[in-house]
Amino acid sequence: DAHKSEVAHRFKDLGEENFKALVLIAFAQYLQQCPFEDHVKLVNEVTEFAKTCVADESAENCDKSLHTLFGDKLCTVATLRETYGEMADCCAKQEPERNECFLQHKDDNPNLPRLVRPEVDVMCTAFHDNEETFLKKYLYEIARRHPYFYAPELLFFAKRYKAAFTECCQAADKAACLLPKLDELRDEGKASSAKQRLKCASLQKFGERAFKAWAVARLSQRFPKAEFAEVSKLVTDLTKVHTECCHGDLLECADDRADLAKYICENQDSISSKLKECCEKPLLEKSHCIAEVENDEMPADLPSLAADFVESKDVCKNYAEAKDVFLGMFLYEYARRHPDYSVVLLLRLAKTYETTLEKCCAAADPHECYAKVFDEFKPLVEEPQNLIKQNCELFEQLGEYKFQNALLVRYTKKVPQVSTPTLVEVSRNLGKVGSKCCKHPEAKRMPCAEDYLSVVLNQLCVLHEKTPVSDRVTKCCTESLVNRRPCFSALEVDETYVPKEFNAETFTFHADICTLSEKERQIKKQTALVELVKHKPKATKEQLKAVMDDFAAFVEKCCKADDKETCFAEEGKKLVAASQAALGL
């Protein structure tokens, strides 16, 4: 449905509040270094212009595309070249190349200060003084640090953020009310950002077909009673939504996501019995709820898959006539029967099935050739099952912190060239799989664990892509989206790595460590552990454990000392010397 003015169309569909919020998110995700005030000014100008177009769709420039309008606005920023360097060259291009150029300059790890949470009273005062500015600032700060955050979902987070302050700033104990809510929003926000980053990477690096395959598998697990045609329709619509959001088309994305939620709720009888509660909620909550809804029960008496996909005489005919549709049907049928499998495992099975048909359907006796294809699935299923069993046992034995440390050592030995902050961040997140998934029964462990690991390893991939240092990381990240985790799991110690020179400064600690939170202190210790492995990649677990135990004792001792700084200086030297001796440095 063509509209004379796209900007007027979206303004009317979304309403002024959502329109302004989404334009702010879009601008902050593109120009991540720009001050808040500059963005607010740009947003207000765009909003005023949109209103003139609503009043008269034939007014000057109202017929321009959103990319043209937004890009022109971004290119008016005076300090573009000083602040962003070569990104300013994007402004010399025409659409659609200009938007592609802006997208390529999105930075997954922008050089921005860590967000420090002010005192509760300070936050509540700011909230009461100017609620609108306070909430815009939240959108801005999250969007610029997470340039692929799913925009309509960020509106949902902002709504919850507002609700937390509205409730807690009136509470008797403001901090007790507010801080847990803010912690929860922060943790959920980081998880949401990482999940969306994988969707965008899937679309941008591996194409629409890869994303659609993922969506078929996931939606078929979630909606096993829905017909294949229904799942296919949802997949097509969901792909459009995510393509738009990942492409910076946030107004279209939010509008289409609302339409999709509306469609799902209007057709829930043919989709899932679990949607009733979600569909009674307001729009933002409804969309979020649908995205998180539990898997529906599997229909009873589903026939064997072999009949249609192995035994039928029409397998090769059907495959040849519509390859992707036939593979989609295979994936749908397999996924709806296996909520206990990870999506990536289901995609590996579908890939194996495809490879087999490609080979066998061109053979002299196709049926004889592909008759045993399901036997090839067994090792693919057992590999993640065994890996999860082993790692959950290790997690239960060690606890989260020490399990993270085991992974830190493991991954530093695999890819020691990767920067220490990245190794710490990624290994800590990998380690969280234990508390997140190992508590689940067997039937839920694999989808929880392996699909979570895919999200975390994608963080490694996008951070590494910015400054590539390891061919092994590049290889695992680019060869196959669904085989990333097995690729990293299969990496052994990098024998080509030349150990890092020993630098005592890296292992020098000060009294400020004593005032850090438990989490920050863990990060300091884990940073030291990574550096230790980089100096001595052949160090045994026992050697590393001994050094880390000494280090923990040293920190505890000096934090209890009267003259902490002196203790850190003197005991620190002894610790470094003892560690060097213990590791043979």
């Epitope: 040849a320 519509a322 549709v325 049907m329 359907c361």
Partner: nanobody
Framework: EVQLLESGGGKVQPGGSLRLSCAAS????????MVWVRQAPGKGLEWVST????????VYAESVKGRFTISRDNAKNTVYLQMNSLRAEDTAVYYC????????????????RGQGTLVTVEP
């Protein structure tokens, strides 16, 4: 809009040969499987042969196996059906077809089809 235009039909004696062609447009031919189906007088649609997008896979109905050969030229957006050793029972209107999104695979009534070309085999 999807268009399929068959040609090459005609009258031929039993044992004779014909080569049917189908020119395609309006869709991505090089990524689409192509099908020949036929309809004998007073009968329903009967599947004849299928060729995959890259021509690596070809499948034939038992009734034509060893006599008919399907092929394609992706550079010319054309699919062919070489028919040898023709029999009276091969008399039919031959349609070239391709999968239509949303239809069931093998449900040829729902596929995109051309107007057809008549093949008559009689002494």
């Amino acid at each position: 809009e999807v268009q399929l235009l068959e040609s090459g039909g005609g009258k031929v004696q039993p044992g004779g040969s014909l080569r049917l062609s189908c020119a395609a447009s309006g869709f991505t031919f090089s990524t689409s499987g192509m099908v020949w189906v036929r309809q004998a007088p007073g009968k329903g649609l009967e599947w004849v042969s299928t060729i995959s997008d890259d021509a690596r896979i070809t499948v034939y109905a038992e009734s034509v196996k060893g006599r008919f050969t399907i092929s394609r030229d992706n550079a010319k957006n054309t699919v062919y059906l070489q028919m040898n050793s023709l029999r009276a029972e091969d008399t039919a209107v031959y349609y070239c077809a391709t999968y239509r999104a949303g239809s069931r695979i093998g449900s040829y009534e729902d596929y995109y089809r051309g107007q057809g070309t008549l093949v008559t085999v009689e002494p």
